[in-house]
């Protein structure tokens, strides 16, 4: 807290300019009018204030706007944004995408801070849903943003927004998140032709059910092993050797390198060794010839 002291004669700030960098903290407090600061916030960023001086400027704004800053000030905070606490940000009402972009730019290149997370949360809640433009902006600054949302939060993403998602945006998503995103992607890309559709849907396939994988296997998609390894184990298990061969195309030989990793390992255990041998890959661990396979889950369902 800076003590209230009178501004020395001739030092009253008429505008926010470079001369203020020579002011001591108490002089800034006494000589800079908060209303003037608020109207000339865009100039603060161009002036090399020290961190201590920025603390004083923030304090003046806090006094002027105890209920939270107006958006006209927020948009021009620049590096002063880094001084804000999540508690400060919770008082804001940010509705403009331009404001959001301006503040994200300040934090660019750094991990998502609690301040940024709070800002994004306030912005998205204010909009009511994660629209395409917002998602575009957020994933541009933070590729992992989408995967930081809970399945419940992801359910508010409209299918139209899925067009903004790049493969790298989904790298850190877990199966529960992909379960939510996949049906939206399927809807978003439904009018595309086979090969174009596969290129777009590929990153979301970790949420695909068995019937969709079977359908894809009829379309000569040549899925690579990296994608196959991300599929849900429960969706892969019912696929036949022939279906997996069609799904992977020339990449089928990659099954050998991954035979001990899920879902390949679990899928191999469900196949007849005879069928696996037809691939000529040396895959081992299938059901020996002559063994009867009882599907106990089916039996339980019938009883």
């Amino acid at each position: 807290e800076v003590e209230k002291t009178a501004c020395p004669s001739g030092k009253k700030a008429r505008e926010i300019d470079e001369s203020l960098i020579f002011y001591k903290k108490w002089e800034l407090e006494a000589c800079v009018d908060a209303a003037l600061l608020a109207t000339q916030m865009d100039r603060v960023n161009a002036i090399p204030f020290t961190y201590e001086q920025l603390d004083v400027l923030k304090h003046k704004l806090d006094e002027l706007y105890p209920q939270g800053y107006p958006e006209s000030v927020i948009q021009h905070l620049g590096y002063l944004f880094l001084k804000m606490s999540p508690e400060d940000i919770r008082k804001w009402n940010v509705t403009s995408l331009e404001t959001l972009k301006a503040l994200l730019e300040v934090n660019k290149g750094h991990e998502m801070s609690p301040q940024v997370a709070t800002l994004i949360d306030r912005f998205v809640k204010g909009r009511g849903q994660l629209d395409k433009d917002t998602l575009d902006t957020l994933t541009a600054f933070y590729p992992g943003y989408l995967c930081s949302l809970s399945p419940e939060e992801l359910s508010s993403v409209p299918p139209s927004s899925i067009w903004a998602v790049r493969p790298q945006d989904l790298d850190t998503c877990d199966p529960r998140q992909l379960d939510v995103l996949y049906p939206k992607a399927r809807l978003a890309f439904q009018n595309m032709n086979g090969s174009e559709y596969f290129v777009k849907i590929q990153s979301f396939l970790g949420g695909a059910p068995t019937e969709d994988l079977k359908a894809l296997s009829q379309q000569n998609v040549s899925m690579d092993l990296a994608t196959f390894m991300k599929l849900r184990t429960d969706a892969v298990l019912p696929l036949t050797v022939a279906e997996v061969q069609k799904l992977l195309g020339p990449h089928v030989e990659g099954l050998k390198a991954e035979e001990r990793h899920r879902p390949v390992r679990d899928w191999i255990l469900r196949q007849r060794q005879d069928d696996l041998d037809t691939l000529g890959l040396g895959l081992q661990g299938g059901i020996p010839n002559g063994y009867l396979v009882l599907d106990l889950s089916m039996q339980e369902a019938l009883s």
Partner: antibody, heavy 119, light 108 residues
């Protein structure tokens, strides 16, 4: 440029654990498994296991029965290999090596991390 | 596990000569699952050949590989000074993946 940068040399006492990191850059981290291979002084290469950074799934060489643990951090494109209950014969250079998912050969290697186990 | 035995352990040759390195497996290896690496002192191994005969990116054409079943060969048609190093064969046909003991190609 594709790079695998490993953490620095370590000196450990018998019975202790060591954790070596391998930071990947210049490629899509989740399209490649990361394998670990070690080389004792003046000896050949020995495969220890691998991790799929996309799923976190691991496969270990049974020789290291429960002593090795491989983990990943997708947010930093880094994999870790921890070896516990160290003994003198674990003194070696430990390499991480990239393996495209669906292949079994290592096309890019880290610079190696020397681990010395001595009382 | 499949044991890979490399021979000879050391090969003493002069630049310009042909080098033939052998890798013998204790049981059959599917040829797609065999590769070769080169390692120089103080350096990490480098992929030379994959799937028995495919040259890795940036590897000169004087290197070639062949073989099937239990017997595999790496050939360097005309040794260059930078080729003097240790060479390892590697199989991933059977778990656990294994490497040969290495062949050191040294200057005569």
């Amino acid at each position: 440029e594709v790079q695998l940068v490993q953490s620095g040399a370590e000196v450990k006492k018998p019975g202790a654990s060591v954790k070596v990191s391998c930071k990947a850059s210049g490629y899509t981290f989740t399209d490649y498994n990361m394998d670990w291979v070690r080389q004792a002084p003046g000896q050949g290469l020995e495969w220890m296991g691998d991790i799929n950074p996309s799923t976190g799934g691991t496969i270990y060489n049974q020789k290291f029965n429960g002593r090795v643990t491989m983990t990943e951090d997708k947010s930093t494109s880094t994999v870790y290999m921890e070896l516990s209950s160290l003994r003198s014969e674990d003194t070696a250079v430990y390499y991480c090596a990239r393996r495209r998912i669906g292949t079994g050969y290592f096309d890019v290697w880290g610079q190696g991390t020397t681990v010395t186990v001595s009382s | 596990e499949i044991v890979l035995t490399q021979s000879p352990a050391t090969l003493s040759l002069s630049p310009g000569e042909r080098a033939t390195l052998s890798c013998s497996a204790s049981s059959s290896v599917i040829s797609s699952y065999l590769s070769w690496y080169q390692q120089k002192p103080g350096s990490s191994p480098r992929l030379l050949i994959y799937r028995t005969s495919n040259l890795a990116s940036g590897i000169p054409a004087r290197f070639s590989g062949s073989g099937s079943g239990t017997d595999y060969t790496l050939t360097i048609s005309s040794l260059e000074p930078e080729d003097f190093a240790v060479y390892y064969c590697h199989q991933w046909s059977s778990f656990p993946y294994t490497f040969g003991g290495g062949t050191k190609v040294e200057i005569k």
